[in-house]
Interface confidence: low
């Protein structure tokens, strides 16, 4: 039987006695920045090109012996996980290794930067097919490391990194915290986050997804036919690098944004036990375990969206938090969330020619998060329509009035410190699907977009008295683009999208003494692109 | 011993350089910042990445590095340029005393300086 980790990432349709998905990543070059490797190991022999690049610090300690097998152990194992003959993910992928970690597995930010520059230079000198760069390492947060990763990503390179093994917020580490890098946490055979001694996998909003990272069988540098089981977020990252190589082999024109959205889309959802994560990190940490797509085509013909959380605003009265989408993504909606419930809503703003989502803290609040819904939609053109506070009992309303524009998201922002309770009117008059409705004292912002064949509909789930959580999901074939709470009264902590489900959280009703007047609804905006569907059918 | 000789050679070159008249005057409104690793045991003081502003011309990296060496030499400090970056970020890697950071931050075109730090296999 195949190792558990390969089975876990393999859709049922591929599963046989052997793990042999199509194409095997053969059109892709994977760069591995790690320790030295044993290139004549039977798992990777002939598949790995050891570059002459080496930039490592001296080993610590006077009596440290550079025993080759020890020096090569980390890198050899990861090379095997990426493309090993027997136990690799992308058995056809070619590998190039750069040595940036010494025999003790230690390197420097500067040495790694020089390695990244070496890759960029190689790419300029001899452009090849798609490139994946695997960074199975972590240091403290580094502005320069993240900046270098951003530049390389913008040059069309896919970077995959380990979230880190510190049982901590991945945003405190680099390159894990770089938004352009695909950051991978580790899970085990039970879909539990991996524990490593007293520590374990990192977590939080800077993690993109998880992958198998415990008891991963792979090449051992002890001999040319030896295997060993190792654990860590490096192993998890190696799985995602392999999956990325497979996807890029099937669709070499994929951009980084498209690849990331596909990785998220094809992941197993909600299988990780979030109880392992600190309570304040659970909502921020993606509950996704990487998997290969079930098919090599058709993936491109759907509307892909993902949720991006901002950093925490901090508690000062006028603090704000900003969530941004990646370069090729469009911000289709913006929401906010505060654990204390004290917030002043959110709105979409333009910043440097790109739309961003900004959330506002309120007096006495512990801080807010902005939550952006970031989507891939060709030829999209979006604008924001705003209605100032209506003041009237019917609440504030705004709709998309431009021809051909559809509503993709609703946001509300208010200046008053406390909206107070507000019994909403009939939530939405029939026949006006392009309308946002909100509290009478709030400004309401409608995100209105035009794209070929784009159609959207509003779906609500309302309850007469607040519960801690109200959810509404989009049906199959539709993608959640917007998630908001109605009417946004003070007991609502906020709204956010989890996969294709809109979640509205309220304060624990047992402690707020709220009344049945305070109805709350989760409002989902579900979209699809007929244009993409038609293009897909033409290709079939 | 080898390292010291190397430093000395670079120092002599820097002293002979006539680049920019070796003026010490900082640019007006210089807002360069210094960054270092928040995890103290991972810090590697003595090696710094000097990052120049994004729009800086390629040739400016070498010129700024030489300028730093010359100004440091006048203050009696040895410096060593370990690497000049061209293909990802404009800037250079320099081995120098932390005493020179204030001087380096005032150089034209400098966006920020980051102290080197350790990374680890995961």
């Amino acid at each position: 039987s195949i190792p558990w980790n390969l089975e876990r990432i393999t859709p049922a349709r591929y599963r046989a006695d052997e793990y042999q998905p199509p194409k095997g990543g053969s059109l892709v070059e994977v760069y591995l920045l790690d320790t030295s490797i044993q290139s004549d190991h039977r798992e990777i022999e002939g598949r790995v090109m050891v570059t002459d690049f080496e930039s490592v610090p001296e080993e610590d300690g006077t009596r440290f012996h550079r025993q080759a097998s020890k020096c090569d152990s980390h890198g050899t194992h990861l090379a095997g996980v990426v493309s090993g003959r027997d136990a690799g993910v992308a058995k056809g992928a070619g590998l190039r290794s750069l040595r940036v970690l010494n025999c003790q597995g230690k390197g420097t930010v500067s040495g790694t930067l020089i390695g990244l520059e070496f890759i960029r230079k190689s790419q300029l000198v001899q452009p090849v097919g798609p490139l994946v760069v695997l960074l199975p390492l972590a240091g403290g947060y580094s502005r320069v490391f993240n900046a270098a990763c951003q530049r390389l990503a913008r040059a069309g390179v896919v970077l995959v990194t380990a979230a880190g093994n510190f049982r901590d917020d991945a945003c405190l580490y680099s390159p894990a915290s770089a938004p352009e890098v695909i950051t991978v946490g580790a899970t085990n055979a039970q879909d539990q986050p991996v524990t490593l001694g007293t520590l374990g996998t990192n977590f939080g909003r800077c993690v993109d997804l998880f992958a198998p990272g415990e008891d991963i069988i792979g090449a051992s540098s002890d001999c040319s036919t030896c295997f060993v089981s190792r654990s860590g977020t490096s192993q998890a990252a190696a799985h995602v690098a392999g999956i990325a190589a497979m996807m890029l082999s099937a669709e070499p024109e994929l951009t980084l944004a498209e690849l990331r959205q596909r990785l998220i889309h094809f992941s197993a959802k909600d299988v990780i036990n979030e109880a392992w994560f600190p309570e304040d990190q659970r909502v921020l940490t993606p509950n996704l375990v990487a998997a290969l797509p079930p098919s090599t085509h058709r993936a491109g013909w759907q509307l892909f969206c993902r949720t991006v959380w901002s950093a925490h605003s901090g508690p000062t009265r006028m603090a704000t938090a900003v969530a941004r989408c990646a370069q090729d993504e469009e911000l289709l909606s913006c929401s906010s969330f505060s654990r204390s419930g004290k917030r002043r809503g959110e709105r979409i703003e333009a910043q440097g020619g790109k739309r961003v989502c900004r959330a506002h803290n309120a007096f006495g609040g512990e801080g807010v998060y902005a939550i952006a819904r970031c989507c891939l939609l060709p030829q999209v053109n979006c604008s924001v329509h705003t209605a100032p506070p209506a003041g009237a009992s019917m609440g504030t309303r705004v709709h998309c009035h431009q021809q051909g524009h559809v509503l993709t998201g609703c946001s509300s922002h208010w200046e008053v410190e406390d909206l107070g309770t507000h019994k909403p009117p009939v939530l939405r008059p029939r026949g006006q699907p392009n309308q946002c409705v909100g509290h009478r004292e709030a400004s309401i912002h409608a995100s209105c977009c035009h794209a070929p064949g784009l159609e959207c509909k509003v779906k609500e789930h309302g309850i007469p008295a607040p519960q801690e959580q109200v959810i509404v999901a989009c049906e199959d074939g539709w993608t959640l683009t917007g998630c908001s709470a109605l009417p946004g009264t003070s007991h609502v902590l906020g709204a956010y999208a989890v996969d294709n489900t809109c979640v509205v959280r309220s304060r624990d009703v047992s402690t707020t003494g709220s009344t049945s007047e305070e109805a709350v609804a989760a409002v989902a905006i579900c979209c699809r692109s007929r244009h993409l569907v038609q293009a897909s059918q033409e290709l079939q | 011993q080898e390292d010291e000789d190397g430093d000395y050679e670079e120092l002599v070159l820097a002293l002979r350089s006539e680049e920019d008249g070796l003026a010490d005057a900082p640019e007006h409104g210089a807002t360069a910042t210094f960054h270092r690793c928040a995890k103290d045991p991972w810090r590697l003081p003595g090696t710094y990445v000097v990052v120049l502003k994004e729009e800086t011309h390629r040739s400016q990296s070498e010129r700024t590095a030489r300028r730093l060496q010359a100004q440091a030499a006048r203050r009696g400090y040895l410096t060593k340029i370990l690497h000049v970056f061209h293909h990802l970020l404009p800037g250079f890697l320099v081995k120098m005393s932390g005493d020179l950071l204030e001087l380096a931050l005032k150089l034209p075109h400098v966006d920020y300086i980051e102290e080197d730090s350790s990374v680890f296999a995961q």
Epitope: V271, N273, A275, P278, N287 | -
Partner: antibody, heavy 118, light 113 residues
Framework: EVQLVESGGGLVQPGGSLRLSCAAS????????MNWVRQAPGKGLDWVST????????NYADSVKGRFIISRDSSKHTLYLQMNSLRAEDTAVYYC???????????WGRGTLVTVSS | DIVMTQSPDSLAVSLGERATINCKSS????????????LGWYQQKPGQPPNLLIY???TRESGVPDRFSGSGSGTDFTLTISSLQAEDVAVYYC?????????FGQGTKLEIK
Amino acid sequence: EVQLVESGGGLVQPGGSLRLSCAASGFTFNNYAMNWVRQAPGKGLDWVSTISGSGGTTNYADSVKGRFIISRDSSKHTLYLQMNSLRAEDTAVYYCAKDSNWGNFDLWGRGTLVTVSS
Amino acid sequence: DIVMTQSPDSLAVSLGERATINCKSSQSVLYRSNNRNFLGWYQQKPGQPPNLLIYWASTRESGVPDRFSGSGSGTDFTLTISSLQAEDVAVYYCQQYYTTPYTFGQGTKLEIK
């Protein structure tokens, strides 16, 4: 061997206090949430309290909230239940149970009897 | 709180025969996002602590004989022993772990007829 061993039970007067201990062995104690479950004589099972692997999160049944405190000592691989203001209805066998980390209990101790009587 | 109700309270079945115990929850314990029912079954023999038999409503704990099976979803669940053995005499409890407070059914006493 993977096991849990409870101790500290006994006879106590109403209003009194007692501290139960549960020694864990054979598994990585820090990785798992732990629970106390009790069973009154001849009755069914009644969940009392849970504590997360790190010890940072605790939950209690309403019937013991404010009177019982669950805690753990990672270095000693031991779970505790401090029981104050005991009542006759707290009389039961108290079991220590390892949590799968989802909320079901995949390993139980043999229990320790607590009798509250004047 | 989620109330768990088992039926019957007691059951007598002949050796080799099928035994069926039902459990009903006052609200659904199916978590839709991962399609798992947060329900377990335990066996408690006289003088012993309980022992986990089934979790996720239908997954057998390792070491549990395959004559034990669990089924059901949402609010209605069943534990089935396909061919009763003498050593199966015990009290059986269902438990929801969907949310705290975790709650157990009142128990079903299984005896040999």
